[in-house]
């Protein structure tokens, strides 16, 4: 039921926007896809959610949303923003989610992001960002999720990530990154998910993933790796690993010995000629093993200690016989 307060709230709804109470005596305001070229001026101070996505907003003035101290989510995706000035988000003390994807930003709006201490989720994907300044995330101590995919990055912004010790998920996919240096993510000890797919990565520092002590998902699919990514050896909690569609020719012996928690590995569409017989040993959690197109494999892998496979796909291989123990090793 509506209370007198919710009536007051709804009277503060901007023209043509859709508004509804959020259940906490605050207001959810949806002004998306209305052809707006500037921000609405008569927003209720009690707004907790503001969706301005899919409009024609090309610039933000300093302090364009005064007094929205209760605003928790601001969506500005799909506009024509090329630059966000210092002070654009001043006073948004409660802001937890900021969506800036699908704009035309060329740089991370460093000054605008300062002091967003409550921010937990930041979307900067699908822009034209080619440079991430070293200190651009330095005040975002609560940040949990960061999207930087589909931009123009050519290298990992190593210094910028040093302050994001609370980060849990990050995507750098669909950029032009060619190398991951040692300790690239050295301070991201809480990171659980890392997407690096669809880049141009051809080389990995041997300690490039050191420090990622919580990582469970690593996606290196669709890159230019020509060697097995041995740097994964530090990822003791890794559960899901993808490096399909690269140029890897061999899976070494004991390839995953440092990753005993692996559940799924995807590495099809690599020109694999050699697979060490011990490569897939001692992976008790592994459920799926797919070796599509590994045309040079002639020996069935030794699956000692890998006893819980539910799906084993070996297409295009040249295995002429199965070991007698294979049925003992599989459930």
């Amino acid at each position: 039921g509506s209370s007198p307060r919710s009536g007051v709230l709804l009277r503060g709804c901007p023209t043509h926007c859709h508004c509804e109470p959020d259940g906490r005596m605050l207001l959810r305001v949806d002004c998306s896809d209305l052809g707006l070229s500037e921000l609405p001026s008569n927003l209720s101070v009690f707004t907790s959610y503001l969706d301005l996505s899919m409009n024609n907003i090309s610039q933000l003035l300093p302090n364009p949303l005064p007094s929205l101290r209760f605003l928790e989510e601001l969506r500005l995706a799909g506009n024509a923003l090329t630059y966000i000035p210092k002070g654009a988000f001043t006073g948004l003390y409660s802001l937890k989610v900021l969506m800036l994807q699908n704009n035309q930003l060329r740089h991370v709006p460093t000054e605008a992001l300062q002091n967003l201490r409550s921010l937990q989720s930041l979307r900067l994907d699908a822009n034209h960002i080619s440079y991430v300044p070293p200190s651009c995330f330095s005040g975002l101590h609560s940040l949990r999720h960061l999207w930087l995919d589909d931009n123009a990055l050519t290298e990992i912004p190593v210094q910028a990530f040093r302050s994001l010790s609370a980060l849990q998920a990050m995507t750098l996919a669909l950029n032009k990154i060619h190398h991951i240096p040692d300790y690239a993510f050295g301070n991201l000890s809480s990171l659980v998910v890392l997407h690096l797919h669809n880049n141009r990565i051809h080389s990995l520092g041997k300690k490039c993933f050191d420090g990622l002590h919580s990582l469970e998902t690593l996606d290196l699919n669709y890159n230019n790796l020509d060697e097995f990514p041995t740097a994964i050896r530090t990822l003791s909690n890794l559960k899901e690993l993808g490096f399909h569609s690269n140029n890897i020719r061999s899976i070494p012996e004991k390839a995953f010995v440092g990753n005993p928690s692996l559940i799924t590995i995807h590495f099809y569409d690599n020109p694999i000629q050699f697979v060490g017989r011990s490569a897939f040993q001692h992976l008790p959690e592994l459920r799926t093993l797919t070796l599509n197109g590994a045309s040079q494999i002639t020996e069935f892998p030794d699956l000692t200690g890998t006893a819980n496979l539910e799906s084993l796909t070996l297409t295009g291989a040249q295995i002429s016989s199965l070991p007698q123990t294979v049925c003992n090793q599989l459930p």
């Epitope: 190593v158 050295g186 050191d210 003791s236 004991k254 010995v257 440092g258």
Partner: antibody, heavy 118, light 111 residues
């Protein structure tokens, strides 16, 4: 609490071998490099090599490569340094340390004095 | 190998005064904006203790009178106000490339 506890002092003859142990506790042993460093009496620090216990990967200082073997036993969270063909100039305190933030050595064992004397 | 050279070899400073130790690497130890240079303190009969990592980051639990600065080849450890318990030998170390190397050490004493 992170701790690295090393084995006791050793006295060896020239040409012999020594094996020093380093037992880790208080953290995930498999996920951090263990580094070995030595310090001759009154001298500075010298890096010997490292091992990543989870994968058995090792790297050695070329100076020691032919005489040093670093191993680990994950079941007991213990790393080992073995140095062969000992000579008097190998007399030193041998330390194990954990490779922490960005490879800095954030926790150290108490040290093991190895004396090589005829 | 990268050679680390510390200066001075020893330093006598009055209590409460500033102590400054320099470390020069024979080649740059910077990579993608990170300086792979760390500082340690060693007291007699004890193992070294990490003070500063990546040139300027204070290790947890280390008093903030210790600070580090520098990049590429030239680095400095500063003790802003020397205390009696700071008497020790201080070492810089690089892990930019194998073999990881240490400076020869700087002995800090009270004047």
């Amino acid at each position: 609490e992170v701790q690295l506890v090393q084995s006791g002092a050793e006295v060896k003859k020239p040409g012999a071998s020594v094996k020093v142990s380093c037992k880790a506790s208080g953290y995930t042993f498999s996920a951090y490099w263990i580094e070995w460093v030595r310090q001759a009496p009154g001298q500075g620090l010298e890096w010997i090599g490292e091992i990543l216990p989870g994968s058995d990967s090792t790297d050695y200082n070329e100076k020691f490569k032919v005489r040093v073997t670093i191993t680990r036993d994950t079941s007991t969270s213990t790393a080992y340094l073995e140095l062969s063909s000992l000579r008097s100039e190998d007399t030193a305190v041998y330390y194990c340390a954990r490779g922490g933030h960005y490879g800095s050595l954030d926790y150290w064992g108490q040290g093991t004095l190895v004396t090589v004397s005829s | 190998d990268i050679v680390m050279t510390q200066s001075p070899d020893s330093l006598a400073v009055s209590l409460g005064e500033r102590a400054t130790i320099n470390c020069r690497a024979s080649e740059s130890v910077d990579n993608y904006g990170n300086s792979f240079m760390h500082w340690y303190q060693q007291k007699p009969g004890q193992p070294p203790k990490l003070l500063i990592y990546l040139a300027s980051n204070l290790e947890s639990g280390v008093p903030d009178r210790f600070s580090g600065s520098g990049s590429r080849t030239d680095f400095t450890l500063t003790i802003s106000s020397l205390q009696a318990e700071d008497v020790a030998v201080y070492y810089c170390q690089q892990n930019y490339e194998d073999p990881f190397t240490f400076g020869q050490g700087t002995k800090v004493e009270i004047k």
